[in-house]
Interface confidence: low
Amino acid sequence: HTAAQDNCTCPTNKMTVCSPDGPGGRCQCRALGSGMAVDCSTLTSKCLLLKARMSAPKNARTLVRPSEHALVDNDGLYDPDCDPEGRFKARQCNQTSVCWCVNSVGVRRTDKGDLSLRCDELVRTHHILIDLRHRPTAGAFNHSDLDAELRRLFRERYRLHPKFVAAVHYEQPTIQIELRQNTSQKAAGDVDIGDAAYYFERDIKGESLFQGRGGLDLRVRGEPLQVERTLIYYLDEIPPKFSMKRLT
């Protein structure tokens, strides 16, 4: 029988190939690019999603000021190396043997070097600041309604436990969502803030990773919340190591 007949699809990751070849004929899904089996009951790791994406055919006052150590993903897409659990390997290299160290969300945190570059450990990103600018509306959104809706979204769509949504700041038209998750806070089964932020980022861009679901329809008290710009800052448990030349 075919996978489709068994409704064998991955609801949380459309960048998979699924077939009923798991134990006892159960549906098993593998990520494109890596071929790794994924757990479709939760979000797929950002590393596996980036790998799958690269394998696909080419086609103010209350606002938080990101610290001097905040990283922004300026390097964009690359084909990452993922470990057997789907996490980013601490050291990433390209085909021309240029290497660099990344954090747990895959963002470069050192200068680029050669194959002799050492990255001793995968440094955890424990604080993510999602900075959104919404399109003009008739009036400002009610802060508490906006806060509740964004917390609901992260809980219900991305299955991120509410304790990891540290704060929602609003100063029209800027919205900031703070996600915090220390290594010690993250229990087995908990969604990683980096994965939730990545799914959210893709949703905001109209590139939902969910299978068959419509795009993200964000509304606050019925009023559509349309985002026109997104910036994401990543703060690591250990500050990044860049040369002074890059910082000036």
């Epitope: 757990d39 479709c40 009951s41 299955r159 436990h161 509410p162 229990a187 089964g189 908990d190």
Partner: antibody, heavy 121, light 107 residues
Framework: QVQLVQSGAEVKKPGASVKVSCKAS????????MQWVRQAPGQGLEWMGW????????KYAEDFHGRVTISADTSTSTAYLQLSSLKSEDTAVYYC??????????????WGQGTLVTVSS | DIQMTQSPSSLSASVGDRVTITCKAS??????VAWYQQKPGKAPKLLIY???YRYTGVPSRFSGSGSGTDFTLTISSLQPEDFAVYYC?????????FGQGTKLEIK
């Protein structure tokens, strides 16, 4: 909206088996666990076990081991509880309830309406 | 198994009262405690999960607190529809266990 609809009331004789169904709708069945809880008349709530609907792996409370089987049919989004070797003390309302997969999420956010199972000779 | 002990087992109160129900776990369950409301002949309804998180649609008069072994459900101003039985549940480890219930009655 999210709903769990259970099968109707059952009357069984001691020693018999009963199978209660719980049909889910309004969400993707394999993205949530299904728990089973029972409540004897005038008593409190007792957890019986749950099934990870994605992996198909069940886990049972020790008190019911060997007598209970929890299963799921993903093609119909239905979970089942089968209890064998029924005794009069098994007379209760049996509930299915939705949960997450990890321990942080083993609370029950949606419940079925309950199925009364009466065991009487 | 983790025992969940609720107190009081029954409680009489009036509309507008502030009511507190406590739940004690026999061992540390971190913040993995949920609270449910059950009315006669109906399935329980989730009020609070992870000790202090109010479930979607639950009125703000319901609040939860606690961690470790001691937990509290507070109803800040009782409404007529709040008279029911309340259960705590630990969702820390299997077997999942419930308190014996607290019956909240009209005085």
């Amino acid at each position: 909206q999210v709903q769990l609809v259970q099968s109707g009331a059952e009357v069984k004789k001691p020693g018999a088996s009963v199978k209660v169904s719980c049909k889910a709708s309004g969400y993707t069945f394999t993205t949530a666990g299904m728990q089973w809880v029972r409540q004897a008349p005038g008593q409190g709530l007792e957890w019986m076990g749950w099934i990870n609907t994605h992996s198909g792996v069940p886990k049972y409370a020790e008190d019911f081991h060997g007598r209970v089987t929890i299963s799921a049919d993903t093609s119909t989004s239905t979970a089942y509880l089968q209890l064998s070797s029924l005794k009069s003390e098994d007379t209760a309302v049996y509930y299915c309830a939705r949960s997450g997969f990890g321990s942080s999420y083993w609370y029950f956010d949606v419940w079925g309406q309950g199925t009364l199972v009466t065991v009487s000779s | 198994d983790i025992q969940m002990t609720q107190s009081p087992s029954s409680l009489s109160a009036s509309v507008g009262d502030r009511v507190t129900i406590t739940c004690k776990a026999s061992q540390d369950v971190s913040t993995a405690v949920a609270w449910y409301q059950q009315k006669p002949g109906k399935a329980p309804k989730l009020l609070i999960y992870s000790a202090s998180y109010r479930y979607t649609g639950v009125p703000s008069r319901f609040s939860g607190s606690g961690s470790g072994t001691d937990f509290t459900l507070t109803i800040s101003s009782l409404q007529p529809e709040d008279f029911a039985v309340y259960y705590c549940q630990q969702h820390y480890i299997t077997p999942l266990t419930f308190g014996q219930g607290t019956k909240l009655e009209i005085k």
